[in-house]
Interface confidence: medium
């Protein structure tokens, strides 16, 4: 570490005095101090001499000696006071610029340490400091305003009490700059706009920032609009607003509008699309198939997307039959708005009952007229099966009726023994009926089919089973011939209650 002679931390001299500061180190050394007149510098290898024959108040300051080759970067310092009775302050800078919340050092150095007790910081023309100004003083460095605020951007003077009167320094201008976190915040309202030709429209572009230095403009299809801005300041932010008013829109007003704001941190932009239409419109659509099939007992949500301008004047869900005159409960219908011109309407149908199959229509109305979208809802049922013994054209015949939706397929099984259901080990014979006769097939109803199995003689220790299946499930009926006549037996598991 270099050594300074005289080896005192502070040196007090009078104006006009000769001052010699010598610094010695292991290698070459360098002086650093406030820019001031009359110093001469003499270097001799490992020592350096700073001297003046005529010290003035402007030589007041801290002089630091460093050894550039020292890896530890050691230094030594001495503070020189040039005690001028007419000049209590040496001001090193007349403008100080800091960012908000930084400490601001106002570099007015006291030329006489004895005056320290009577120093104060004031604003120019003797005005007091603003409330909540937190500051401290160091005779070596000056006044520090801690965590400076934008509002403290003022002109300051350092004051010292000399012989009972206050002596001021020249003024120091403090500029506290806002910390600009990024480009201005932007809003463009509305996010989307539709108007009929001839209607009025308004688009508002606004930008705000903590700092007043920013630009904002509105452009239409990349062409800047010359709309003047309205400026405001609230919530500690500067706001600039551009309002585009169009009394009677035409097709040339349509297109992309961008709100663009920029400052030193960069640029932000946001866009919206303005559509001009010839007349009112109302479009209904669904992402779902309009023909729906759901298993009985399950639930279904029917969804309709509506695109409309102007807004809807009315809408409702209607059940068009064929089973009953019930109407969907309003509580099961709800609407959600995606944006100004697009809405989704949902009808919830929980735990569907047989009487709820049929047509559901969504109707909507706006000045463009009425539109409707109709869903057809068919319920799926597992097959129900029954078997009877009868004679057809003199032949003994087992007649199996199966009803369900979709249309059931029919399989006959003959198996040994009396059983509720033939299992593989007992099966003697299997017949598939690829084309059972369709007895009834009305829209939204179950399909009933009939399959005939001609049996010349019924084997009494055997079971004849009719099995029907579709995509929902299967059903069966076991027919057991007994000597007293035929005995039919539906299996327990098919006592179906919807």
């Amino acid at each position: 570490i270099p050594v300074i002679e005289p080896s005192v931390p502070e040196l007090v001299v009078k104006p006009g005095a000769t001052v010699t500061l010598r610094c010695v180190g292991n290698g070459s050394v360098e002086w650093d101090g406030p820019p001031s007149p009359h110093w001469t510098l003499y270097s001799d290898g490992s020592s350096s001499i700073l001297s003046t024959n005529n010290a003035t108040f402007q030589n007041t300051g801290t002089y630091r000696c460093t050894e550039p080759g020292d890896p530890l970067g050691g230094s030594a310092a001495i503070h020189l006071y040039v005690k001028d009775p007419a000049r209590p302050w040496n001001v090193l800078a007349q403008e100080v610029v800091v960012f908000e919340d930084q400490d601001a050092l106002l570099p007015c150095l006291l030329t006489d340490p004895v005056l320290e007790a009577g120093v104060s910081l004031v604003r120019v023309r003797g005005r007091p400091l603003m409330r909540h100004t937190n500051y401290s003083f160091s005779p070596w460095h000056g006044f520090t305003i801690h965590r400076a605020k934008f509002i403290q951007s003022q002109d300051y003077q350092c004051s010292a009490l000399m012989g009972g009167r206050k002596v001021m320094s020249i003024s120091i201008r403090l500029k506290v700059q806002k910390v600009i976190p990024g480009p201005p915040a932007l809003t463009l309202v509305p996010a989307e706009l539709v108007r009929i030709r001839g209607e009025a429209a308004q688009i508002v572009c606004s930008a705000s920032s903590v700092d007043v230095n920013f630009d904002v403009f509105l452009q239409h299809n990349n062409t800047k609009l010359a709309i003047p801005q309205q400026s405001d300041f609230h919530n500690n932010r500067y706001q600039k607003v551009l309002t585009l008013n169009l009394d009677q829109v035409d097709f040339q007003h349509a297109g992309n509008y961008s709100c663009v704001a920029s400052n030193v941190q960069g640029k932000h932009s946001t866009s919206m699309f303005f559509r001009v239409v010839e007349s009112a419109y109302l479009n209904l659509s669904s992402e779902q198939n309009l023909i729906q099939e759901v298993t009985v007992g399950e639930g279904l949500n029917l969804k309709v997307m509506v695109e409309a301008y102007p807004g809807l004047q009315g809408f409702n869900w209607t059940y068009l039959g064929p089973f009953s005159d019930h109407q969907p409960e309003p509580k099961l219908a709800n609407a959600t708005t995606k944006d100004t011109y697009r809405h989704t309407f949902t009808l919830s149908l929980p735990r569907l009952k047989p009487s709820e199959a049929g047509r559901y229509s969504f109707l909507a109305r706006n000045p463009g007229g009425w539109r409707a979208l109709t869903f057809e809802l068919t319920l799926r049922y597992p097959p129900e099966v029954s078997v009877i013994w009868t004679f057809i054209n003199g032949s003994g015949t087992l007649l199996c009726a199966a009803s369900g939706y979709p249309q059931p397929n029919v399989t006959w099984l003959q198996c040994s023994g009396h059983t509720d259901r033939c299992d593989e080990a007992q099966v003697l014979q299997v017949w598939d009926d690829p084309y059972p006769e369709v007895l009834s097939q009305e829209p939204f109803h179950k399909v009933t089919v009939q399959s005939l199995l001609t049996v010349e003689t019924l084997e009494h220790n055997q079971t004849y089973e009719c099995r029907a299946h579709n995509s929902v499930g299967s059903g069966s009926w076991a027919f057991i011939p007994i000597s007293a006549g035929a005995h039919t037996h539906p299996p327990d598991e098919f006592l179906f209650t919807p």
């Epitope: 009025a200 800047k224 609009l225 309205q230 008013n245 169009l246 007003h253």
Partner: antibody, heavy 116, light 107 residues
């Protein structure tokens, strides 16, 4: 379609105050920004300033601050006052509208002569 | 303020000629410039907006180009009704300023 019509005296004496009014039809005065432009005989065009329905104004700083703009939304009119006129203020005064760019609609202009 | 300097200040040409008028801005104004035509006793009429877009209803012989500080108005195949005074106007920043005008006369 917005239409503009200037009205006011054709002749004003030096040192007097000039008052011009522009009447707006075919559109709402609350929608746009309303400007005045002047053109001395045989010379170029000079923008004077604009006023918004809210009363906000913006003047051309190159011109002396003798101009005052005002607006009366109930009458769909806006006005210009120029105090202490001199011969240098002799010009055709146009009112114009800034809708999306300057100047979408113009009045036909009114000649004001300053002479004793 | 942004100064707009137009050249030439006057120009003589014949019907059928192609003429070019230049406007220079004292600082960059992107493409925030319009061209106007003015006939004696009439209000100015916009020909070109945003430096190069043709105003609706204006004949296609008029065209504009440029951005930043240098702009031109070109009239292809001059017609008798084109003899008038032409002004450029900047609206990049307030105050709005006009060029001093170019008077186009019949040779």
């Amino acid at each position: 379609q917005v239409q503009l019509q200037e009205s006011g005296p054709g002749l004003v004496k030096p040192s007097e105050t000039l008052s011009l009014t522009c009447t707006v039809s075919g559109g709402s005065i609350s929608s746009y920004y309303w400007s005045w432009i002047r053109q001395p005989p045989g010379k170029g065009l000079e923008w004077i300033g604009y006023i918004y329905y809210s009363g906000n104004t913006n003047y051309n700083p190159s011109l002396k601050s003798r101009f005052t703009l005002s607006i009366d939304t109930s009458k769909n009119q806006f006005s210009l006052r120029l105090s202490s006129v001199t011969a240098a203020d002799t010009a055709v005064y146009y009112c114009a509208c800034i809708a999306t760019r300057p100047f979408d609609y113009w009045g036909q202009g009114t000649l004001v002569t300053v002479s004793s | 303020d942004i100064q707009m300097t137009q050249s030439p200040s006057s120009l003589s040409a014949s019907v059928g000629d192609r003429v070019t008028i230049t406007c220079r801005a004292s600082q960059g104004i992107r493409n925030d410039l319009d061209w106007y035509q003015q006939k004696p006793g009439k209000a100015p009429k916009r020909l070109i907006y945003a430096a190069s877009s043709l105003q609706s209803g204006v004949p296609s012989r008029f065209s504009g180009s440029g951005s930043g500080t240098e702009f031109t108005l070109t009239i292809n195949s001059l017609q008798p009704e084109d003899f008038a005074t032409y002004y450029c106007l900047q609206y990049n920043s307030y105050p709005i300023t006009f060029g001093q005008g170019t008077r186009l006369e019949i040779k």
